[in-house]
């Protein structure tokens, strides 16, 4: 089991300049570590790739909201 405390932090040095289709996104995490040069959102796609995105952009906020709602909706 990896030690989360010592796990390396993924930092984003640049953000995508493309709006990613929400259907392509599976999950996200926020990067707020002081070890990183800027705050970021990292989306994980349905093919398990990571995308660095700017949390200030509306499409990023909308996508996070969408994924949050998906997580909250119970599967039947």
């Amino acid at each position: 089991q990896p030690d989360a405390i010592n796990a390396p932090v993924t930092c984003c040095y640049n953000f995508t300049n493309r709006k990613i289709s929400v259907q392509r996104l599976a999950s996200y995490r926020r990067i707020t570590s002081s070890k990183c040069p800027k705050e970021a959102v990292i989306f994980k796609t349905i093919v398990a790739k990571e995308i660095c995105a700017d949390p200030k952009q509306k499409w990023v906020q909308d996508s996070m909201d969408h994924l949050d709602k998906q997580t909250q909706t119970p599967k039947t």
């Epitope: 993924t10 796609t45 990571e50 995308i51 660095c52």
Partner: antibody, heavy 119, light 107 residues
Framework: QVQLQESGPGLVKPSQTLSLTCTVS??????????WNWIRQHPGKGLEWIGY???????YYNPSLKSRITISIDTSKNQFSLTLSSVTAADTAVYYC???????????WGQGTMVTVSS | DIQMTQSPSSLSASVGDRVTITCQAS??????LNWYQQKPGKAPKLLIY???NLETGVPSRFSGSGSGTDFTFTINSLQPEDIATYYC?????????FGQGTKLEIK
């Protein structure tokens, strides 16, 4: 502005191993969200995606080449590399390195390096 | 793997013409399609992503459309500098695959 530059031998003998390196300048190869790809183009033909590597070392290889290829990364040198074993004349191609930002679009390319497999 | 079929394989057109290239996927790929331009002796250049979105800095005479299995790439008013080979690329799933290319020449 990130730039990519391929380097390696232009001539390789059949059955030998081809090794190419792509040097990333103008940005860190360790930046999250950047995937570092190899793509080749046979003379006068279309494009064939070979595989990618992430800064973490995660890789994905085209199944058609998987048994012969290895993509590795050296974050200290800001480089990633391709090795292709047991080459034949069919591996003669221009080899490109390219970046995608996790969104599956190759937005930055090297200029390409021609590799000929011949004895 | 998904097969991408481009047509025509080559075409000749005059400056100012409207040029259309099609790309057909062997299965539904939603809008997960990119278009690239490759000039002789150069690396490909991304023009359009997600089937219809213009990459930053690309002239507005280029456009793309389509979804599912059938896609179209259009140059509205052909310019001499548009002489190149154009490729589609799907990214519905890995491994990525490209069309065989359409070589565009000026009449």
């Amino acid at each position: 502005q990130v730039q990519l530059q391929e380097s390696g031998p232009g001539l390789v003998k059949p059955s030998q191993t081809l090794s190419l390196t792509c040097t990333v300048s103008g940005g860190s190869i360790s930046s999250g969200g950047n995937y570092w790809n190899w793509i080749r183009q046979h003379p006068g033909k279309g494009l064939e995606w070979i595989g990618y590597i992430y800064y973490s070392g995660n890789t994905y290889y085209n199944p058609s080449l998987k048994s012969r290829i290895t993509i590795s990364i050296d974050t200290s040198k800001n480089q990633f590399s391709l090795t292709l074993s047991s080459v034949t004349a069919a591996d003669t191609a221009v080899y490109y390195c390219a970046r995608d930002g996790g969104d599956d679009a190759f937005d930055i390319w090297g200029q390409g390096t021609m590799v000929t497999v011949s004895s | 793997d998904i097969q991408m079929t481009q047509s025509p394989s080559s075409l000749s057109a005059s400056v100012g013409d409207r040029v259309t290239i099609t790309c057909q996927a062997s299965q539904d790929i939603s809008n997960y399609l990119n278009w690239y331009q490759q000039k002789p002796g150069k690396a490909p250049k991304l023009l359009i992503y997600d089937a219809s979105n213009l990459e930053t800095g690309v002239p507005s005479r280029f456009s793309g459309s389509g979804s599912g299995t059938d896609f179209t790439f259009t140059i509205n008013s052909l310019q001499p500098e548009d002489i190149a080979t154009y490729y589609c690329q799907e990214y519905n799933n890995l491994p990525y695959s490209f069309g065989q290319g359409t070589k565009l020449e000026i009449k």
